[in-house]
């Protein structure tokens, strides 16, 4: 029994790793601005983008880069429980705190923020730099998509890396991870194509999530084939002239729920890592 | 001056480090093992293509990732003259051979095997579980493009780690690096949208050359609507049935010149980043 | 020629359910979008939903999602309509009809009458 | 959901003039479609992204309109141009038709 709360404790954790962010701004600095000048450099590359084939192609190709970047930057998550392993294991053994008030304390104060701002300046710098999508629950759907993304694959770093004493394993196994979850994301393949005992590895895929809910948002209801002019019975049944048509051939369910879906699956996986992250430090404590 | 030859220096140079790679086998066969592995992986993910839509979508994701997997695996390179460093500054100093007949032994007998094995497995798993184009030529140009594309991204990689103490930082460059180059390949974003001021950055980018003639390779004489006797003028602008509408969308030159210019611009390539990383190491003897 | 051939007139009971058949032929079916439509007497259009034979994507007007159920038969070039829990409001003329796309409707099929009566 | 309402419900009208049917949209679309049904038959496609016409279909139709608002106009009425027409829309995945006009002979 401790003679403090949870809410202390948790209170006492957080306000100690926030002074130790804040006490050393380097490193979030240099994100930030890392974060800004690559946000600035897409905004750049696909300035103003058309409404015709290279729109399709430069919209999935944009989204893509963000979810695969989201998903890669969160690598670096694999740190948050590994440096301070024995700082924790001295701290709990000494009565400290629990495990809970540890863990919730290092993901409000530390994952929540070094996670959510990424989210808000790419999406602030590139949504109308790109001109996509000109309605503001567009806007915010994709902001929330690529923080669920940042926090679900920074779930599964803390999954992997809680408890562990070197981070360079933990990084090369996330890594590894990530690119089988690229292939899988559903711009390097056609996810309707994919052999039916294969096809099942993508619902395991964090960046295919974020990917399809950003598709689904930005491509419902535009067009890609301005002032089209043509024959009836001709190639142009091969064209993708709207992006309900682009969807459908990427095997995107086009309802509301096509949408959130991938947000529910996000959550899910986020818990569920979140719970093996929680698990493992607990265990670690029992073998300290 | 050295009483042995450049000759003789080179070959005592290569025989060494070749002995050093068959006295410690698991790395090498660790590599051949990943490499037949992912590349079963990548058969099976995209298993007989299609000649529709998808096989577009398809052709042109398994094409990137074979280039920009080229690419990040070439970073390990860096070690090639970073772990010997010491080493070598100490033989050379004591006039064991000359900075060429290291350079060019090294080269010989880690860098050229070990960069051309991943190149020969993936096209020869690949090339026929996918069903890409069925001729010889097609096949041993794809087997050449990825080998020069091992090649130039193993020589940037020494250009950028040449006469470095640790690996780390010449790591975390390449793969900054790598990430731009792999924006500006041809699949994230339309090559032919960039702004001008912007575009001229394409021509640095070695996984542009690589996809490039991979997908010049592929698509040329390729039909993507079936049922339908396309001709190469179609009469609908926003479809593309056929592998020259394709490659005209993506700003691809259909002449021979348009396949052969990627691999003299790759061989350039590794003129210079060879020339530069033999630059460094004889400078680097000049501050020991 | 392109055709569209349906299945025959179909009188049901309420409560009951009903699948109609729509046959395709001179094209290539998995590369067309095939619709369903109906037509009460004197009402408009209404559209039920469509599904894409290449890859059996399906989407469904909301009136009708839970009743009516979009198949496909890739190998016998034959798309299928079924709606359950049938009313005597859903006395009508069933059509299918192939998209270009999700652009337009360039072929029709001569359509079915599906009578619900007790 | 989007809703088109078609204007005039029945037109009556002799042969050899002018006929005018309006389409209009509750919100912006990027082109409509128009189909032609007779009694006892399918309906069939007239008119297709909003100005271009479909195979068979006489030059005396013609399509017009952006936005909200469209036309179906007939330059002179012939008499196996009396039949119901229907303008349609897609947008966010799903078709709407208009309520119809009937064009009949005065």
């Known amino acids: 029994s401790y003679t403090t709360s949870f809410c202390h404790q948790l209170r006492w954790v957080s306000k100690r790793s926030f002074k130790n962010l804040l006490g050393n701004p380097q490193a979030s600095i240099a994100q930030i601005i890392v974060t800004v000048i690559l946000g600035l450099v897409i905004g750049a590359i696909y300035f103003g983008l058309n409404n015709d084939s290279t729109g399709i192609q430069n919209r999935a190709g944009v989204l893509f880069f963000l979810t695969t970047n989201q998903c890669f930057s969160s690598v670096s998550a694999v740190e948050l429980f590994v440096v301070e392993k024995k700082l924790f294991i001295h701290e709990y053994i000494s009565g400290y705190y629990r495990v809970s008030s540890y863990f919730f304390g290092k993901l409000l104060s530390d994952l929540l923020p070094m996670r959510m701002l990424p989210s808000i300046i790419f999406t602030c710098i590139v949504y109308f730099m790109l001109g996509l999508k000109p309605t503001a629950d567009a806007f915010f759907i994709m902001m929330f998509t690529l923080m669920m993304v940042a926090y679900s694959a920074s779930s599964m770093a803390l999954a992997i890396a809680a408890g562990q004493s070197v981070v360079s394993v933990a990084t090369l196994l996330m890594t590894i991870c990530f690119v089988f979850m690229m292939i899988f994301s559903g711009l390097l393949v056609n996810l309707t194509t994919i052999a039916s005992w294969l096809s099942w590895l993508q619902y395991f895929s964090i960046p295919r999530y974020g990917f399809t809910a950003l598709q689904h948002n930005e491509f419902l209801g535009q067009n890609f084939c301005p002032g089209l002019n043509a024959t009836v019975n001709n190639t142009c049944n091969y064209a993708t002239c709207t992006g309900e048509e682009y969807l459908t051939k990427q095997g995107i369910d086009l309802s509301p729920w096509g949408l959130w879906k991938n947000h529910v699956a996000l959550a899910c996986m986020i818990v569920i890592f979140l719970t093996i992250a929680y698990l493992k430090l607990l265990f670690l404590k029992k073998y300290s | 001056s050295y009483t042995t030859s450049f000759c003789h220096q080179l070959r005592w140079v290569s025989k060494r480090s070749f002995k050093n790679l068959l006295g410690n086998p698991q790395a090498s066969i660790a590599q051949i093992i990943v490499t037949v592995i992912l590349g079963l992986v990548i058969g099976a993910i995209y298993f007989g293509l299609n000649n529709d839509s998808t096989g577009i979508q398809n052709r042109a994701g398994v094409l990137f990732f074979l280039t920009t997997n080229q690419c990040f695996s070439s970073v390990s390179a860096v070690e090639l003259f970073v772990v010997e460093k010491k080493l070598f500054i100490h033989e050379y100093i004591s006039g064991y051979y000359r900075v060429s007949s290291y350079f060019f032994g090294k080269l010989l007998s880690d860098l050229l095997p070990m960069r051309m094995l991943p190149s020969i497995i993936f096209t020869c798993i690949v090339y026929f579980m996918l069903g890409l184009k069925p001729t010889a030529d097609a096949f041993f140009i794809m087997m050449f493009t990825l080998m020069m594309v091992a090649y130039s991204a193993s020589s940037m990689a020494l250009a950028i780690a040449a006469g470095q103490s640790v690996v780390s930082v010449a790591t975390l460059l390449m793969t900054i690096c790598f990430v731009f180059m792999m924006i500006f390949s041809g699949l994230l974003v339309n090559l032919t949208t960039i702004a001008s001021w912007l575009s001229w950055l394409q021509y640095f980018s070695i996984p542009r050359y690589g996809f490039t003639a991979l997908q010049h390779n592929e698509f040329l004489g390729q039909n993507f609507c079936p049922g339908l006797n396309a001709t190469v003028n179609n009469t609908c602008n926003y479809a593309t049935c056929t592998g020259e509408e394709y490659l005209t969308k993506q700003g691809i030159d259909l002449s021979p010149w348009g396949l052969w210019k990627n691999h003299v611009a790759l061989a350039c390539m590794i003129v210079i980043f060879l020339t530069i990383a033999y630059l460094k190491l004889l400078f680097l003897k000049k501050y020991s | 020629e392109i055709q569209l051939v349906q299945s025959g007139a179909e009188v049901k009971k309420p409560g009951a359910s009903v699948k109609v058949s729509c046959k395709a032929s001179g094209y290539t079916f998995t590369d067309y979008y095939i619709n369903w439509v109906r037509q009460a007497p004197g009402q408009r259009l209404e559209w039920i939903g469509w599904i894409y034979p290449g890859n059996v994507n399906v989407k469904y007007n909301e009136k009708f999602k839970g009743r009516a159920t979009l198949t496909v038969d890739t190998s016998a070039s034959t798309g299928y309509m079924e709606l359950s829990s049938l009313r005597s409001e859903d006395t009508a003329v069933y059509f299918c009809a192939r998209s270009i796309g999700l652009r337009y409707f360039d072929n029709w099929g001569q359509g079915t009458l599906v009578t619900v009566s007790s | 959901e989007k809703v088109l309402t078609q204007s005039p419900a029945t037109l009556s009208l002799s042969p050899g003039e002018r006929a005018t049917l309006s389409c209009r949209a509750s919100s912006s679309v990027h082109y409509m479609y128009w189909h032609q049904q007779k009694p006892g038959q399918s309906p069939r496609l007239w008119i297709y992204y909003t100005s271009n016409l479909a195979p068979g279909v006489p030059a005396r139709f013609s399509g017009s309109g952006s936005g909200n608002d469209y036309t179906l106009t007939i330059s002179s009425l012939e008499p196996e141009d009396f039949a119901v027409y229907y303008c349609?829309?897609?947008?966010?995945?799903?078709?709407?038709f208009g309520g119809g006009t009937k064009l009949e002979i005065k």
């Open positions: 349609q829309q897609f947008t966010t995945s799903t078709w709407t």
